[in-house]
């Protein structure tokens, strides 16, 4: 009658939606040699087997091509390769060694594979800093993909200036060229297995390293509301006495270090305020002139100055000789 | 003990027919596939025809298709080979063998001779 | 019709020497290979099935490896009783095929 072998190994098997799994199988080590003939996994139930090697019998449509017969009589592996897993494989397997010229065969026992949602998800790679105007190659990897699967398709989604480079079976590689204005934007990567008809996808923000592209100052005059300037002012008119605070604000990342100074300052000047802020509490003759905003950053300094005028007041200074 | 017995062997004229037989003891002959195999003097070894155990598959070697005919009685543990047409290059000990796709046991064969 | 090819198709060698014999098919047939060894005036004998796999009862100085179209048959000792005539045979399709022989002499 048929002779029956067990299984070694797992009673179930789990594989996600997409990806590879090896049922293991070991032939008998007592096998008649008239016994010894094509290998058949079949479908629990199905007369059609999904994997043979018997060049003479068709398989199940929907697994051929993925469901492969690793065959190696001397090592005894009668094991069933599976790739792009769909959730319609989800049932349980047994292999059958026979001949059709013999009566019987050697039947395994019952194997169930359990096809699961696939929750891993890209990776997404960035050697070192971003910057602004540089070359950088970022890597989308799906390192969980099996090299015998249907390769993945690699999708890229991101407003910066990009060109594809090599991919492999498990990794795509994206070539960007980022602009400050693309710092804080979203960079996508999306990865779908066509032999399962499954896509995943990975969203990262960009953290581009910029040099200030813009500088201004914002003045407060007492109570009165505040005013910007953008550019390089030759003349702001004060009144003497009046509370004055300047406010330095620049782009540029990681942030500017911003600093103050009176005059046109040289490179190594000290700064009068290490900060964006400059409070002049009562202006007067000594804050008549220029002060200027320094925006110091590793890829570059920016500077925007103004130049106070100072009002007098009409009883204002002592008269002279 | 597992044995095959081939019988029917002779001297037989260009164009005439033989029939050979195999009788089988020692085994459960309608689990196993049955084959036979020739062997010209002199020469190597021809595979002639093969028979499945329930008589589902048969296949037959180029040279000998569309005038031998291999069948099997299970129920008198007997393979034969009906030898149609038969000519002088068919002269050759006939071996009656079991197996799959392996031949694993051969028996003592009988020598066929077509001459005129 | 797959065509199976051996080589040597003779050789000569002494008790005690390594011996090897090929074996080529026309096209690919996995491991559905097997070897035979004949002695004149008796019947052949299985001696490995599946390309690599020993028969029982058979000494273990006989083995056999390879898959696809390339086959060898090692006799890793040889013994008087070993001087013979050694087939191979392919089972992957119908019609099957012996290789054309090879004969092993005493030198």
């Known amino acids: 009658q048929e002779r029956r072998f067990q299984l070694e190994g797992p009673e179930s098997l789990t594989v996600q939606e997409g990806l590879c799994v090896l049922v293991p199988c070991r032939l008998p080590t007592t096998l008649p040699a008239s016994y010894y003939g094509y290998g058949y996994w079949f479908l629990e139930g199905a007369d059609v087997p999904v994997a043979t090697n018997d060049p003479d019998e068709e398989v199940q449509e929907e697994t051929r091509g993925r469901f492969h017969l690793l065959w190696d009589p001397r090592r005894k592996n009668c094991s069933l390769s599976i790739r792009d897993a769909r959730r319609r494989d989800n049932a349980a397997y047994f292999f059958r060694l026979k001949s059709k010229w013999m009566k019987y065969g050697y039947t395994s026992s019952k194997l169930s594979v359990r096809v699961m949602a696939l929750t891993h998800r890209p990776n997404i790679s960035i050697p070192g800093t971003l910057e602004s105007g540089h070359p950088s190659n970022l890597t989308c990897s799906v390192p969980w993909v099996c090299e015998q699967g249907t390769p993945p398709i690699f999708s890229w989604m991101s407003a910066a200036p990009t060109s594809l480079g090599p991919r492999t079976t498990q990794s795509s590689v994206l070539t960007i060229t980022p602009r400050p204005q693309d710092h804080s934007t979203n960079l996508t990567c999306q990865v779908t297995f066509p032999g399962a008809g499954v896509t995943m996808e990975r969203t990262i923000q960009l953290n581009v390293s910029y040099a200030p592209q813009k500088v201004a100052i914002s003045i407060f005059q007492g109570n009165s509301a505040a005013f910007k300037i953008l550019q390089n002012t030759s003349s702001l008119p004060v009144l003497e006495g009046q509370a004055l605070r300047l406010l330095c604000d620049a782009d540029g990342n990681p942030p500017a270090h911003l600093s103050w100074f009176q005059g046109f300052p040289a490179l190594n000047a000290t700064p009068i305020s290490n900060t964006g802020v400059l409070e002049l509490p009562q202006v007067g003759s000594a804050e008549e002139g220029d002060f200027t905003c320094r925006a110091q950053h590793p890829l570059g300094s920016l500077q925007i100055s103004l130049s106070l005028f100072v009002h007098w007041k009409p009883e204002g200074r002592a008269g002279g000789v | 003990k597992v044995q095959l017995l081939e019988s029917g062997g002779g001297l037989v004229q260009p164009g005439r027919s033989l029939r050979l037989s195999c009788a089988a003891s020692?085994?459960?002959?309608?689990?196993?596939?049955m084959h036979w195999v020739r062997q010209a003097p002199g020469k190597g070894l021809e595979w002639v025809s093969g028979?499945?155990?329930?008589?589902?598959?048969?296949g037959y070697a180029d040279s000998v298709k569309g005038r031998f005919t291999i069948s099997r009685d299970n129920s008198k543990n007997t393979l034969y080979l009906q030898m149609n047409s038969l000519r002088a290059e068919d002269t050759a000990v006939y071996y009656c063998?079991?197996?799959?796709?392996?031949?694993?046991?051969w028996g003592q064969g009988t020598m066929v001779t077509v001459s005129s | 019709d797959i065509q199976m090819t051996q080589s040597p198709s003779s050789l000569s060698a002494s008790v005690g020497d390594r011996v090897t014999i090929t074996c080529r098919a026309s096209?690919?047939?996995?491991?559905?290979l097997n070897w035979y060894q004949q002695k004149p005036g008796k019947a052949p004998k299985l001696l490995i099935y599946?390309?690599?796999s020993l028969q029982s009862g058979v000494p273990s100085r006989f083995s056999g490896s390879g898959s696809g179209t390339d086959f060898t048959l090692t006799i890793s000792s040889l013994q008087p009783e070993d001087f013979a005539t050694y087939y191979c045979?392919?089972?992957?399709?119908?019609?099957?095929?012996f290789g054309p022989g090879t004969k092993v002499d005493i030198k």
């Open positions: 020692g085994f459960t002959f309608d689990d196993y596939g």
């Open positions: 096209q690919s047939i996995s491991s559905y």
């Open positions: 045979q392919q089972s992957y399709s119908t019609p099957f095929t």
């Open positions: 599946a390309a690599s």
């Open positions: 063998a079991r197996g799959g796709q392996t031949i694993d046991i």
């Open positions: 028979i499945s155990w329930n008589s589902g598959s048969i």
